[in-house]
Interface confidence: low
Amino acid sequence: DGCKDIFMKNEILSASQPFAFNCTFPPITSGEVSVTWYKNSSKIPVSKIIQSRIHQDETWILFLPMEWGDSGVYQCVIKGRDSCHRIHVNLTVFEKHWCDTSIGGLPNLSDEYKQILHLGKDDSLTCHLHFPKSCVLGPIKWYKDCNEIKGERFTVLETRLLVSNVSAEDRGNYACQAILTHSGKQYEVLNGITVSITERAGYGGSVPKIIYPKNHSIEVQLGTTLIVDCNVTDTKDNTNLRCWRVNNTLVDDYYDESKRIREGVETHVSFREHNLYTVNITFLEVKMEDYGLPFMCHAGVSTAYIILQLPAPDFRAY
């Protein structure tokens, strides 16, 4: 069929709860492309009717909720004007017996479900929730050994649980829970997280490395839309937060009312020794006030900025 296979992604998922997967592969999906989802080499595309339990939502495939029979290989076909690429996603669905210690936990946990806290430090756990914008997520609750987490040492901040002065007792089985609303219906999203404690400050005390940006300026026309990626490499066991800030404030908070500048959803690619993270910042419309202001990408203790600059006037036009 002339489509080039890009990669196979394996996902192990809990039954009876929502799941979504975004068919994105920069730079292919950055241009003018059409995305179509199929199941198990079927010639019939996944439904786009939002009332369907399984349907395509823009570039996403959305399961509301996931069920036993949904295990299998799904293909996402990305067609451009002169190209065709295919991503294979192997989904394995299992029944998670929450709070039942007599039955084992999650099989073959992916990195998102295994997290590390550093002894004696202030650290954090992340609740990985990846859904299309048609899904509205409520506030996140955190549980440890099936009891809701409360106490002065714990603070819930957006998708993270901040833990101050980590102790050995903080190891164990955690879960983050959110209520997802889609088309007037509500579903529970639950992620189990196995937490271990380490005294190391990461691999040899290494710090995240920001590949891009590199403390530079970008020429951009007034009124245009701009998307800038922050690319970070970090150790696989890291618990660092990656975010964009302006004037020492998270961009989503700084532009809370206008929502003109927003931080994107973080994605990552896993390599043998490290992870490559990408989190973008989107300027829906560049305004005069944006020029000359450092927009900072933070990754743990590492920072890098971009400064927007008006293009030099092109005198050849006169």
């Epitope: 009876s16 017996h97 929450w98 709070c99 039942d100 609750k141 549980y143 809701e148 529970e188 639950l190």
Partner: nanobody, 128 residues
């Protein structure tokens, strides 16, 4: 509006059986935990049995283990409580409850009843 309607209660002799049903209507979401609770005259509300939305995870209080069975229909909109070998101490008003979360102690027999909805109750009297 969400409604949970219990039925199947009544008078039964010790050693007898009853099957309670709870029909849920008006649900705007897929419930993750359904359960039965009971309250005997002058006693505290007690968790009897709960079942997860997937149907594979169940909880029974020690007082009913081996005698009561909780189940649900394929559509997961009705939950049943099959009660065998009934005793006088099983006399109580039985309430059906439903909630979004399989976490939190309520779904596992804890005393913090964090369920989202509950019914009006059905009276079970075990007497000779």
């Amino acid at each position: 509006d969400v409604q949970l309607v219990e039925s199947g209660g009544g008078l039964v002799q010790p050693g007898g059986s009853l099957r309670l049903s709870c029909a849920a209507s008006g649900y705007s979401y897929r419930t993750q935990c359904l359960g039965w609770y009971r309250q005997a005259p002058g006693k505290q509300l007690e968790a009897v049995a709960t079942i997860s939305g997937g149907g594979t995870s169940t909880y029974y209080s020690d007082s009913v283990k081996g005698r009561f069975t909780i189940s649900q229909d394929n559509a997961k909109t009705t939950v049943y409580l099959q009660m065998n070998s009934l005793r006088a101490e099983d006399t109580a008003v039985y309430y059906c409850a439903a909630g979004l979360s399989v976490l939190g102690s309520w779904c596992h027999g804890g005393s913090s009843y964090e369920y989202t909805y509950s019914g009006q109750g059905t009276l079970v009297t075990v007497s000779s």
